[in-house]
């Protein structure tokens, strides 16, 4: 059947619309377009004849249409005059005419809305508020925004004149928003500049701070008042019901215990013409003495002796307190208290036993700390390290080790090679290096406070060739974008260049590519499931090169979202159903199935023989991968129509 | 109800064949791998290797790579496990378990078992 | 291929006691753990899978956990029919491997 379809249907004006013509018959003649729902020919637009390919004007041609060999009609630059209907009056080669209408209407492109009100500075639960929606627009909607959210339902908003009006009753400090309104016709949507509302309100009753209410003598005092108040409070203080000044801080320094007293703080807004008073009691104590800290043992030894700290003076009827790193005391079996809290014992010390430690003596108003104690903790040596790392020296350089042990007082070191004594030194230098000078270097730290010793013993040699290095790995199986990688070519060589190889190509350029330690590391940020390659390090010196085994870097990753296969989602009755799952992952994923939410089997594909229509619904793949931690899944629908009445799929 | 019903007990000499048969009901057989697992007598478990019937995908313990040979037969849901060269301390009980799913799954139901004597 | 370390190898306990079983695997095989009880002359029985999920039908008193290398069955109140020997199987890629197993007796 013939159809017009116009394009758009809704048209602003000065755009253009197109009429478009369906199911054209074959063996045309020629064909008319009209002005209206009828054939007029007062009220022809343009005729088309199809055999010599000309278009003639008719009355109510205007010079703006253009017709189409297939007979749509373009209307360019339209005008309001133009909505309304069009009829196509198609002539046959047998003379047999066919006719077809379409319409479609005109709107005017809206201008940019502004919003009027009635009143700008509202007083809070007293005033209301009118808001305008500027110009008033024939065949516009009107809507409203508050602070870009569409408007909440209140009983104290309401929306009048053709929702051009948003009135808002008994105005809050809350309706303190930024207002827009909007205005929409079929073909154009235009939104105000925002009006913000300035809602005078306060002030609220005040509040003083700080809140503690007690000092001792010769404290400052600081107090501060805050009101809620739109515009801001005016303050004044009162100190035993006499005015002291109009500020907002009342400061009194080296108070007594004379400065005790009611405290009030007015606040008064002078557009509300309101003022309200918050009223607080403060109380000056005398000063208390100062307590110390006295040690039965200065100098106590690691693991080996007790040291008693104990609180002064001794007060009765008084609360002491400990702090030890300015933390109260931990729960620890070596920590203990006397019955009265002023001897804090601590049993067996270890070198993180130094403190500081304080402690306090309470009063009615506050603590008084005194200065505080360190421990000076005699310990170790541990056993100490030997620097540089490397193991691997060529002939002809310099051999420069250097030894530390963490001890209390300072370690005295010693260096034997070979089990042979050489110095006393923390640092041991030997120049110019040769093979005889490989060996067992070992480096001895003594305490002379604790009478104890540590060794430790690192094996030199001094060697033109370069071992077979091989690579060590912080993290054998790491999570896709979650773990980074640390590969560090081993061993650790003096005056030696390291190198890396990719599947046997250099390291590509990559933000994610880090090399660092002299380029004997290697660290892969975030890694991904294309990380998944083999890595070799290689060393060189100017003598000779080696290169290490590949190590492959296994990726956890996944699963990825489930793809079910095939895509059919229709089927016949009496089909099999065969769907089968695939999610990319590393290790495998476990797979398993749900039917509307039922628990299924865990298999990679779901067969149902002969389904029927009771088969409908939803088939969910899940997988998941512990490895990663991550799952995913998937949901198709399936329709199964009885034999015959639809011509869907088969499996 | 999933069923796994094996083959008979066989006695074999040293150096000879062996081939154990599986056979399935109860599921949809080319969904399931099905898996071979040994103990040997007041011994633990060993696990052999896999077979997917669906595709006759296999995958073998290092241990029996070359000496076990796994197929299956659709037409008649079975899985049989074939292990050459035989020596005495192949005597066991010879299982085979289905997969409770596919990839990285324990094994849900298992065979009675087929005790195989290797003797000379 | 990762090795799968039971303890103890066998214990006993009374009716009602409280057992643990522990499982430790030579590398992460993170929550891939499955436990098999297997009673004198019968087939193994799957409990658990994934370290901690309840195979369906087996009683509540059987629990599983940990994650990584270290895993536990609990029987948490031991009853006459649970005399068996329980293995644990890491199944985190092939080859699958069981642990030696862990005898279970009523004192």
């Known amino acids: 059947k013939l159809t017009i379809e116009s394009t758009p249907f809704n048209v602003a004006e000065g755009k253009e619309v197109l009429l478009l013509v369906h199911n054209l018959p074959q063996h045309l003649f020629g064909y008319s377009w009209y002005k209206g729902e009828r054939v007029d020919g007062n009220r022809q637009i343009i005729g088309y004849v199809i055999g010599t390919q000309q278009a003639t004007p008719g009355p109510a041609y205007s010079g703006r249409e253009i017709i189409y060999p297939n007979a749509s009609l373009l209307i360019q630059n339209i005008i309001q005059n133009d909505t309304g209907f069009y009829t196509l009056h198609v002539i046959k080669s047998d003379l047999v005419n066919e006719e077809a209408t379409g319409q479609f209407r005109v709107y005017p492109e809206l201008p940019k809305p502004s919003i009027s009100s009635n009143n700008s500075k509202p007083v809070e639960d007293k005033d209301a508020v009118a808001f305008t929606c500027e110009p008033e627009t024939q065949d516009a909607t009107y809507l409203w925004w508050v602070n870009n959210q569409s408007l909440p339902v209140s009983p104290r908003l309401q929306l009048s004149n053709g929702n051009r009006t948003l009135t808002l009753f008994n105005v809050t400090r809350n309706d303190t928003a930024s207002y827009k309104c909007e205005t929409q016709n079929p073909v154009s949507a235009r939104r105000s500049d925002s009006v913000i509302l300035n809602v005078l309100y306060g002030p609220d009753a005040p509040t003083i701070s700080p809140l503690n209410t007690s000092y001792r003598s010769g404290e400052n005092l600081n107090l501060s008042c805050h009101a809620a108040s739109n515009p801001p409070a005016q303050y004044s203080w009162f100190v035993n019901g006499t005015f002291q000044q109009s500020t907002q801080e009342l400061f009194i320094p080296n108070i007594t215990v004379n400065n005790s007293g009611s405290y009030t703080c007015q606040a008064h807004n002078s557009d509300t013409g309101l003022n309200r008073t918050t009223v607080t009691t403060i109380t000056v104590y005398a000063e208390p003495p100062k307590p110390f800290i006295t040690s039965n043992n200065s100098n106590p030894v690691e693991d080996e002796d007790a040291v008693a700290l104990t609180c002064e003076p001794e007060i009765q009827n008084t609360t002491y307190l400990w702090w030890v790193n300015n933390q109260s005391l931990p729960v620890s079996p070596r920590l203990q208290l006397s019955n009265d809290n002023r001897t804090l014992t601590l049993l067996s010390v270890t070198r993180n036993d130094v403190g500081p430690y304080e402690c306090g003596i309470q009063n009615e108003l506050s603590v008084d700390h005194s200065d505080p104690v360190i421990l000076n903790v005699l310990y170790g040596p541990d056993d100490p390290t030997i620097s540089p790392s490397y193991t691997y020296y060529r002939p002809g350089v310099n051999l420069s080790l250097s030894c530390h042990a963490a001890s209390n007082p300072p370690a005295q070191y010693s260096w034997l090679i070979d089990g042979n004594i050489q110095q006393h030194t923390q640092e041991l230098f030997i120049s110019n290096i040769t093979e005889k000078n490989s060996g067992l270097y070992t480096c001895q730290a003594n305490n002379s406070a604790s009478g104890h010793s540590r060794t430790t013993v690192k094996t030199i040699t001094v060697s033109a060739e370069l071992p077979k290095p091989s690579i060590s790995s912080n993290n054998s199986k790491p999570v896709e974008d979650k773990d980074a990688v640390a590969f560090t070519c081993e061993p650790e060589a003096q005056n030696t260049t390291y190198l890396w190889w990719v599947n046997g190509q250099s390291l590509p350029v990559s933000p994610r590519l880090q090399l660092s330690n002299g380029n004997r590391t290697l660290t892969l940020f975030n890694v991904t499931r294309n990380d998944a390659r083999a890595y070799v390090c290689g060393i060189q010196n100017s003598v000779s090169a080696n290169r290490s085994d590949p190590v492959t870097l296994d990726v956890l990753y996944g699963p990825d979202t489930p793809i079910i296969s095939p895509p059919d989602s229709s089927y016949l009755s009496g089909a099999n159903l065969n769907l089968s799952c695939h999610s990319a992952s590393n290790p495998s994923p476990q797979y398993s199935w749900r039917i509307n939410g039922i628990p299924q089997q865990h298999t990679q594909v779901l067969f149902i023989a002969k389904i029927t229509p009771n088969n409908n619904g939803t088939y969910a793949c899940f997988v998941s991968n512990l490895a990663t931690g991550r799952n995913n899944s998937i949901v198709k629908s399936i329709t199964v129509s009885a034999s015959g009445t639809s011509p869907g799929l088969s499996a | 109800q999933v069923q796994l019903v094996q083959s008979g007990a066989e006695v074999k000499k040293p150096g000879a064949s062996v081939k154990v048969s599986c056979k399935a009901s109860g599921y949809i057989f080319t969904s399931y791998w099905l898996h071979w697992v040994r103990q040997a007598p007041g011994q633990g478990l060993e696990w052999i290797g896999y077979?997917?019937?669906?595709?006759?995908?296999?995958n073998y313990s290092q241990k029996f790579q070359g000496r076990a040979t796994m197929t299956a037969d659709t037409s008649t849901s079975t899985v049989y496990m074939e292990l050459s060269s035989l020596r005495s301390e192949d005597t066991a009980v010879y299982y085979c378990?289905?997969?409770?799913?596919?990839?990285?799954?324990?094994?849900?139901?298992w065979g009675q078992g087929t005790l195989v004597t290797v003797s000379s | 291929d990762i090795q799968m370390t039971q303890s103890p190898s066998s214990l006993s306990a009374s009716v009602g006691d409280r057992v643990t079983i522990t499982c430790r695997a030579s590398?992460?095989?993170?929550?891939?753990l499955a436990w098999y009880q297997q009673k004198p002359g019968k087939v193994p029985k799957l409990l658990i899978y994934n370290a901690k999920n309840l195979v369906e039908g087996v009683p509540s008193r059987f629990s599983g956990s940990g994650s990584g290398t270290d895993f536990t069955l609990t029987i948490s109140s031991l009853q006459p029919e649970d005399v068996a020997t329980y293995y644990c199987?890491?199944?985190?890629?092939?080859?699958?491997?069981f642990g030696q197993g862990t005898k279970v007796e009523i004192k």
């Open positions: 378990a289905r997969e409770y799913g596919n990839y990285n799954y324990p094994l849900d139901y």
């Open positions: 077979i997917n019937p669906n595709t006759g995908y296999t």
């Open positions: 590398e992460n095989i993170y929550g891939y």
């Open positions: 199987q890491h199944h985190y890629g092939t080859p699958y491997t």
